[in-house]
């Protein structure tokens, strides 16, 4: 978790002087509770946006938006703590909006936005906005939370982001797999425009079962420049096991931008359909 272009963080708006600060996610009001605290945020919205860095890289970011309730507690609102928790790692990153002037009611509802938390493809986050100061131990909660799952790199809009392109998202191998005679598979795929090696991982399964009955790894050396974007054809020999008929072929590239952590592509060959057994012809006695 990190912030995008940290220097450009702004939270001021007409009628409010505000600054964005780093936060330890442990606001002082936890330790020194106040008697009067503001109410919770209203209408918290989390959206996936895309933002360019000053270097021109494109990143997915969490766009956080919320409004204030129209009650007198805004007189005691000193700011907000924005927290993003990545659920699978428990990593948390916070920033604090610090209000440098008192809020006053005006003809429009107060609305706040922040779009600087960089999020990762295929990760789930819990986004929380806490109004500050936080409530006393038994006070009503004054925060709102939403969970938010970022699409993976196969998503059309995500595919062109810098983290996805770095992991090889633009490569479409267009894998085809055909079963040959004599227990063989022919695997064909399109090479990318980089002199890097590939690995084909074959895993076979019995019909309708998920424990493998055969595994095989095949190394493909780095192609020469004239072979870029050409089809590579590989014939794999299967183990002659009756019923070991469902094959998953996975191609792992080793691009320089992602090394051994590149996006893998796979294709599956199903077991052949079993022909219906013909009805037995009943024995019969001729009538003559």
């Amino acid at each position: 978790l990190r912030l995008l272009d940290h220097r450009a963080l702004v939270c001021s708006q007409p009628g409010l002087n505000c600054t964005v600060k780093n936060s330890t996610c442990l606001d002082d009001s936890w330790i020194h509770p106040r008697n009067l605290t503001p109410s919770s945020p209203k209408d918290l919205q989390i959206q996936l946006h895309f933002a360019h860095t000053q270097q021109g890289d494109l990143f997915p970011v969490a766009h956080i938006e919320w409004t204030l309730q129209t009650d007198a507690s805004i007189l005691y609102l000193e700011g907000a703590e924005l927290s993003v928790l990545q659920l699978n790692t428990n990593e948390r990153l916070c920033v604090r909006f610090e209000f440098l002037s008192k809020l006053r009611h005006h003809h429009r509802r107060w609305r706040f936005t922040f779009s600087h938390f960089v999020v990762d493809p295929d990760q789930e986050y819990e986004v929380t906005v806490h109004h500050l100061p936080k409530p006393i131990p038994d006070g009503d909660p004054n925060h709102q939370s939403k969970n938010f799952l970022v699409p993976d790199c196969e998503h059309a809009r995500m595919k062109v982001t810098t983290p996805c392109m770095s992991s090889g998202s633009l490569w479409d191998p267009n894998i085809t797999v055909e079963t040959l005679e004599a227990h063989q598979l022919r695997v064909s795929f399109t090479l990318w425009n980089e002199s890097t090696h590939y690995q084909i991982l074959l895993t076979s399964f019995p019909h309708m079962e998920n424990h493998s009955c055969f595994e095989h790894m095949h190394h493909i050396p780095a192609p020469r420049p004239e072979e870029f974007h050409q089809r590579s054809n590989v014939t794999l020999t299967l183990r002659n096991l009756k019923g070991c008929c469902r094959h998953q072929v996975q191609i792992q590239p080793f691009f320089s931008s992602c090394l051994n952590d590149c996006l893998r592509h796979s294709a599956t060959v199903s077991c052949p359909e079993m022909p219906d057994t013909p009805e037995p012809i009943p024995d019969y006695m001729p009538l003559w």
Epitope: I46, H49, K146, H155
Partner: nanobody, 127 residues
Framework: EVQLVESGGGLVQPGRSLRLSCAAS????????MHWVRQAPGKGLEWVSG????????DYADSVKGRFTISRDNAKNSLFLQMNSLRPEDTALYFC????????????????????WGQGTMVTVSS
């Protein structure tokens, strides 16, 4: 025109099944997460189920878990809700809804994350 049209509702006996469909048009259906939300007579909106853009993630309200199954067919711009073991308390107007953003609002606190709703299809569970 951006639109969602639900179908498949009707009167059904307790314990029986129904399959709701939602046909989408006017937007890139395959890019967006979709949800089912219901409203029982005289009650507020209740989120039922959600599905991510590629079906990789599916979530259900506790009240329908194990009985309802959400699915989608991106090639046909369609969303489905298979409802089994129906109960009288499932009686409601069922809406499909599209997420405003490209992400997926998980955890069921999502009713305000939708920007397009269908007109609803009525499901009545009664003997």
């Amino acid at each position: 025109e951006v639109q969602l049209v639900e179908s498949g509702g009707g009167l059904v006996q307790p314990g029986r099944s129904l399959r709701l469909s939602c046909a989408a048009s006017g937007f890139a259906f395959a890019d967006y997460a979709m949800h089912w939300v219901r409203q029982a007579p005289g009650k507020g909106l209740e989120w039922v189920s959600g599905i991510s853009w590629n079906s990789g993630r599916k979530d259900y309200a506790d009240s329908v878990k194990g009985r309802f199954t959400i699915s989608r067919d991106n090639a046909k711009n369609s969303l489905f809700l298979q409802m089994n073991s129906l109960r009288p308390e499932d009686t409601a107007l069922y809406f499909c809804a599209k997420e405003r953003s490209l992400g997926y609002c998980s955890g069921g606190t999502c009713s305000d994350a939708f920007d397009i709703w269908g007109q609803g299809t009525m499901v009545t569970v009664s003997s």
